[in-house]
Each structure stands twice: as C-alpha cells, then as structure tokens.
Interface confidence: medium
C-alpha cells in the first residue's frame, strides 16, 4: 500500500492526531489534501517545522497561502521562523523575524496565545 | 492583470538542450510556484515539474528527472525550463503556468506556449 | 502514478443539447481535481477547480461533480463556442496528472 492510499484510510481518523502521529506522517508521501489539514488540532500542528509540512501537504503546500489567515495555518505560522516560511516560496507572512530568540514559556502562551519573543 | 510570457519557438537537433522561458507579471512572483506542462501533437498534457520562485527549489516528474531543469531568476521575474538531451518524442509546445493563484488549485493561467521542434 | 482517464474519446452533439464528459482517477483523490477546455492552436482554460467550483468568468452551464476516483463535466446546453478539447487533471499528488482528453464538437 503506497502513501496515498494509507492516507485515505486513515483520512477520517486524522482531526485528533497527535504531533507525533503528523510528524510520522510528514515521512510517508501522503499529500494530505488542505481540507483535512485544516482540521487538525491547532495544538498537533504548531510544533510541526516548515519542512515538515511540506512534506506532509505534498502538491497541497501551494493552498497554504489561501489559508494564512485561517486556524490552524495562522497560529502555525506565528511559530515559524520567517526565514523559514520564506523557503515555502508561498510569501507568507507573520513569522518570527530573524534575529529574535523564541522562549518556550507556555503560561506566558496560554494567556495570550502567541509565543514570547525577546529582540535581537 | 496575470500575464506569463513565454519565449519564442525553437527548432533543435536531437541530442542538443533547449532552455525556454516565462516572464511572469501581474502578481508576487515569489508567492507562487511556477510549473511546466508540455503538449506533444494530438498527446495529452504531461506535467514536468515546478519550482519554488523564493528558494529555487524544484519536483520533477520521474520521467524527465535526470533531463529537466527548472530555474528562476527572482529579479526579473521569469522562470526557466530546460531539456537535454532531446529527441523528437520531445517535439511539443512547452507551457508555463502558475498553481494556486490567490485561492484556488489549478492552473487558471497558462504562458502562450512555446512550440519546440526536434528534428535531424 | 496516478492515472487519469476520459471518457468518451469524442463527443458530437447538437447546439442546446447536454454533453457529459467522465473522468476516473487509479485511486483516490477526494476533490482535488480540475477541469480545463483547449480549443485548437490555444492554450487551456480553466473552468472547474476541487471538482465543482467553477473559476470566475465560466459560464454556469459548465458543471463538475464528484468525489473520491469518479469524477463528471456536464455541459447542461452545449453552444458552438464550447468546441474544443477537455481535460481533466488531478492535483492530489505528485506527479499532476491529466486526462486523455475528450474532443466535443457540434453536430
């Protein structure tokens, strides 16, 4: 069975999976289409990396710049490191500017919902 | 106004390269990937690869793989395509288009279309 | 690869008739899925993205529907102008693959 086709049985499975599970995923060419990976747990999302879901949304990859202002995609991107979005060639928006140091500190996150950064 | 526009009609002899290109206008060059789709006579579309306007990044169709090479130049907004090794099985007219304009798949615009012609 | 095939090869039909175009995919696709008409000596037209949107500008007799590996366009009354070839193409995953084509003229 090729990637594809375990992708489309487990498609219905998918709205609950964790990080661990999408980051296995990301591995097997499975070219998740967008509609379900908007329906992802915001929370199994943000800690995927940018090469990550690429590799995970295949051909779909392209769809997330329609979808930049809409969760998961807009917290996702608040995460990533705006140099690394740049690499997506997708002119997304939004990231951690370059030089900044991201600090884990998630009561600080949980309050307000994006990450602590401390200027270069 | 999205215009893509390709360069002229080539005639090669089997064996040499042809590079063609596309001068994209009328959006974010680098938002965007580009693709190339060839059309041999009374053939069906072939899709041949694409690339990644802002980190020049490219996939390839298996089939063409190890004689394609997709580049862009991001200063002048065009993106280039170039065969080697041709034979006449090569004879097409050679399409850009760009995937996924704002929100929707698809290729909703496409270059005029460069025919190349392989012939001893 | 996923192999995408149409069906039937050509189709004539008459100006104000339907027309109906089938295209089936090797596995499956969801709706990720579009729909493109060639006419002769120009390059496609987009008229059908995820399988039933149409792109701005195409009338609304143009339909497409379907899910999963079965996928139809539907002409509701065909009009000389929707002479050409059509095509279908999936973008589900790499490689894009299209259609034969199907090749509608006007009796």
């Known amino acids: 069975m090729n990637g594809s086709e375990y992708f489309v049985k487990i498609q219905s499975f998918l709205g609950g999976a964790p990080t661990e599970d999408l980051k296995a995923l990301s591995q097997q060419n499975v070219s998740m289409d967008l509609a379900t990976f908007m329906k992802l747990r915001t929370d199994a999302v943000l800690p995927l990396t940018v090469a990550e879901v690429q590799k995970l949304l295949g051909p779909h990859v392209e769809g997330l710049k329609a979808e930049e202002r809409h969760r998961p995609v807009r917290d996702w991107i608040l995460r990533q490191r705006q140099d690394d979005l740049d690499t997506l060639g997708l002119g997304l928006q939004g990231g951690i500017p370059n030089g900044y140091l991201v600090l884990d500190l998630s009561m600080q996150e949980a309050l307000s919902g994006t990450p602590c950064l401390l200027g270069p | 106004e999205v215009q893509l526009v390709q360069s002229g009609a080539e005639v090669k002899k089997p064996g040499a390269s042809v590079k063609v290109s596309c001068k994209a206008s009328?959006?974010?060059?680098?938002?965007?990937?580009m693709h190339w789709v060839r059309q041999a006579p009374g053939q069906r579309l072939e899709w041949m690869g694409n690339?990644?306007?802002?980190?020049?990044?490219?996939n390839y169709n298996e089939k063409f793989k190890n004689r394609v090479t997709i580049t862009v130049d991001k200063s002048a907004s065009t993106a280039y395509m170039e065969l080697s090794s041709l034979r006449s099985e090569d004879t097409a007219v050679y399409y850009c288009?760009?995937?996924?304009?704002?929100?929707?798949?698809?290729?909703?615009?496409w270059g005029q279309g460069t025919l190349v012609t392989v012939s001893s | 690869d996923i192999v995408m095939t149409q069906t039937p090869l050509s189709l004539s039909v008459t100006p104000g008739q339907p027309a109906s175009i089938s295209c089936k995919a090797s596995?499956?696709?969801?709706?990720?899925i579009a729909w493109y008409q060639q006419k002769p000596g120009q390059s496609p037209q987009a008229l059908i993205y995820?399988?039933?949107y149409r792109y701005s500008g195409v009338p609304d007799r143009f339909s497409g529907s379907g899910s999963g590996t079965d996928f139809t366009l539907k002409i509701s009354r065909v009009e000389a102008e929707d002479v050409g070839v059509y095509y279908c193409q999936q973008y589900n995953s790499y490689p894009l693959t299209f259609g034969g084509g199907t090749k509608v003229e006007i009796k």
């Open positions: 690339v990644n306007p802002s980190s020049g990044g490219s």
């Open positions: 995820s399988a039933s």
């Open positions: 596995q499956n696709v969801g709706t990720n």
């Open positions: 009328g959006y974010t060059f680098t938002s965007y990937w």
């Open positions: 288009a760009p995937h996924y304009i704002g929100s929707r798949p698809g290729f909703a615009y």
